[in-house]
């Protein structure tokens, strides 16, 4: 018996087609992805093959103005239209709190939404009961297939699930649910979830009875043969894990942003054992036409987005200096504003010993692309912010050793004075540079804001300590020459859309007046630009 698994993960609000790098589509003939194009390919496969499941491994939420405006209603509407068979909850599904998950998505989805390792307690238990499930048995042709869901147990640090959801260890929670499926005589079981490739492989190895793992969260690109676009494969598709009980378990993921449709064919014997598995992600490029009816629906929903982007979010009473003459040479108040917004977006009081789990932010000055003039009645719109942050990135959470941070700050000024983008803007950090010293030895003071304290204060950076830092995904991926971050980071979790983070902060503050306040200093009276 053959099953075709179509899968997506980490789509992050890319409802419309995008450019090759998943930012805004400029030249339509070279654009990719989007739900209209995805629907064309899914329908083509459904017509050609008998037993097809379309699965999503979480993080549909968050990533573009679509989510900012529609808050998840767009996810339910278009996933229903595409007739997804099941979805696992990702960490970003909790970005607008539990209510922001229940009302737009859990209540409106026409397909099961799954997670076995999230347990509700207190008053939420009865409110959310039945709205998401640990597993679902799906009828496929004359057979049944069990889908068991899982979600990153780091979600309380990455999103806003509140205090009435407990995120258990994935493997511990999955095993009894898989065992339950076995007692129901379900002998073909897919683990569908959102905890990253390393956990996906562990689940394949450790959870007895799981036949296939379909994952997300780490945006992992797997491919067999010559890859069709810019993504470099982390391994073959499917990635085969030998389980502790000796079975070969295929593990798959389909990069992110709806650029690819994962396509995995599994052959089962009559006892539900996997005989063979093969496939590859399908690049959703312009050779696949966009479905006209879904496209028309997208265009109808789009209208509200254009109206939103010109509405006032809040006001500034000071000039927001995002000029390259400032942000690439010294502390600029636009950099301070953005970093303050980044920290504010990551306030999670999950431990009494810590005022917050993260206090530090770094931001490449080259990522700040425009100032905002306060002389326009102080008005700040989404459109204004999109000029400041035009690349459609995210502000991510990483864990780094102090020694890596020191290297990053040395890199920040290694060729100072050439208006290069690597000059770092900061939050929760005080840095002093001496430009008279040779490159690689210019950081003379680096103090960081404590987290395990009731009164936050600045302490010298410790080289061997592990620190959490919020930074643009561009830096986490080694951009602007920050190879040391990419190579040495200990953990990386994708965060919220950059513009959304700043716009939420401005809306919350109502009136802003960021200052230049001595976060970055130069000693030795060295002349600088």
């Amino acid at each position: 018996w053959e099953l075709t698994i179509l899968h997506t993960n980490d789509v992050h609000s890319r409802l419309e087609q995008t450019s090759e790098d998943s930012s805004k589509c400029v030249n339509a003939s070279r654009c990719m992805g989007g739900v209209a194009r995805l629907f064309t390919k899914v329908q083509q496969i459904r017509r050609a093959e008998p037993n097809v499941l379309l699965l999503d491994a979480g993080d549909q939420y968050q990533g573009t103005i679509w989510f900012t405006v529609y808050k998840g209603a767009e996810v339910a509407h278009f996933m229903n239209a595409l007739r997804y068979d099941a979805m696992a909850l990702g960490n970003h599904e909790f970005d607008n709190g539990v209510e922001g998950l229940i009302e737009p998505l859990l209540k409106e989805a026409k397909f099961p939404i799954l997670s076995a390792n999230i347990k509700a307690k207190g008053p939420l238990a009865s409110q959310i009961s039945g709205l998401y499930l640990p597993y679902k048995v799906l009828p496929v042709g004359d057979e049944v297939v069990g889908i068991v869901g899982y979600t990153s147990k780091e979600t309380p640090f990455l999103s806003n699930p509140g205090t009435n959801l407990v995120f258990e260890d994935e493997i511990t929670a999955l095993q009894p649910e898989v065992d339950k499926l076995k007692t129901l005589n379900v002998n073909k079981i897919i683990a569908l979830g959102h905890s990253g490739f390393e956990m996906d492989k562990l689940i394949a190895q450790k959870v007895r009875g799981v036949d296939v793992v379909v994952g997300g969260h780490s945006n992992t690109f797997l491919y067999t043969g010559n890859p069709p676009s810019k993504e470099v494969p982390a391994g073959k598709y499917p990635f085969i894990v030998t389980s502790d009980d000796g079975r070969k378990v295929p593990v798959v993921q389909a990069y992110a942003f709806g650029k690819y449709l994962g396509y995995l064919k599994i052959e089962f014997d009559e006892r539900g054992n996997v005989i063979s598995s093969h496939g590859n992600p399908i690049l959703l490029n312009s050779s696949i036409p966009e479905d006209p009816s879904i496209k028309a629906d997208i265009n109808k929903w789009r209208i509200k987005l254009d109206n939103y982007s010109t509405q006032e979010l809040g006001k500034t009473i000071v000039y927001l200096d995002g000029s390259s003459q400032s942000c690439r040479f010294r502390e600029c108040n636009m950099g301070n504003l953005i970093c303050d917004a980044m920290i504010n977006n990551n306030l999670r009081h999950t431990d009494e010993m810590f005022w917050n789990h993260v206090s530090m932010c770094i931001l490449n000055g080259g990522g700040i692309r425009s100032p905002i003039d306060e002389r326009n009645n102080g008005t700040i719109t989404w459109e204004n912010l999109a000029a400041v942050l035009p690349f459609g990135g995210t502000f991510d959470l990483v864990q780094l050793k102090g020694s890596t941070l020191k290297k990053a700050f040395e890199h920040s000024v290694h060729r100072y004075g050439q208006s290069t983008g690597e000059f770092l803007q900061v939050g929760g950090i005080h840095v002093v540079y001496d430009l008279s010293r040779k490159p690689g030895d210019r950081v003379v003071k680096l103090d960081v804001l404590c987290t395990k304290c009731r009164v936050p204060s600045y302490d010298p950076l410790k080289m061997d300590e592990v620190y959490k830092v919020i930074l643009p995904n561009f830096l986490a991926n080694g951009g602007d020459g920050f190879q040391m971050i990419k190579d040495e980071l200990l953990r990386h979790d994708s965060g919220d859309q950059d513009i959304n983070v700043v716009s939420t902060y401005i809306s919350k503050m109502k009136v802003i007046y960021p200052a230049v306040e001595g976060r970055i200093k130069f000693s030795h009276h060295h002349h600088h630009h």
């Epitope: 026409k110 397909f111 799906l138 009828p139 049944v144 129901l184």
Partner: nanobody, 124 residues
């Protein structure tokens, strides 16, 4: 919380009719496929009929085809099973079940929520 309550059972003579109702609460019926199942003493549970979430697809066991009709009234949050030309072998406890999914299936294991049963006895 998803709850289902089956009613309308009773004692009826062979050749007679009954209409079973399944009232659902705690969710929007529109998004759920509903199935009717029955279990006679000493026998395995049997999938009798189902109606998919859009109401456009129905399915019946061979043993009831042409005699039973399933329908849904989403405004009343109710699914009905009209049973005509009843036979003694239709005697059983009848249950309704719900699953949030598009497709109609008479396999019991695919349903997530179950109602209390209602007894149907066909006897002269």
């Amino acid at each position: 919380d998803v709850q289902l309550q089956a009613s309308g059972g009773g004692l009826v003579q062979p050749g007679g009719s009954l209409r079973l109702s399944c009232v659902v609460s705690g969710f929007t019926l529109d998004y759920y496929t509903i199935g009717w199942f029955r279990q006679a003493p000493g026998k395995e549970r049997e999938g009798v009929s189902c109606i998919n979430s859009s109401g456009g697809v129905t399915n019946y066991a061979d043993s009831v085809k042409g005699r039973f009709t399933i329908s849904r009234d989403n405004a009343k949050n109710t699914v009905y099973l009209q049973m005509n030309s009843l036979k003694s072998e239709d005697t059983a406890v009848y249950y309704c079940a719900a699953q949030k999914y598009y497709y109609c299936s008479r396999k019991g294991e695919v349903y997530d929520s179950w109602g209390q049963g209602t007894q149907v006895t066909v006897s002269s």
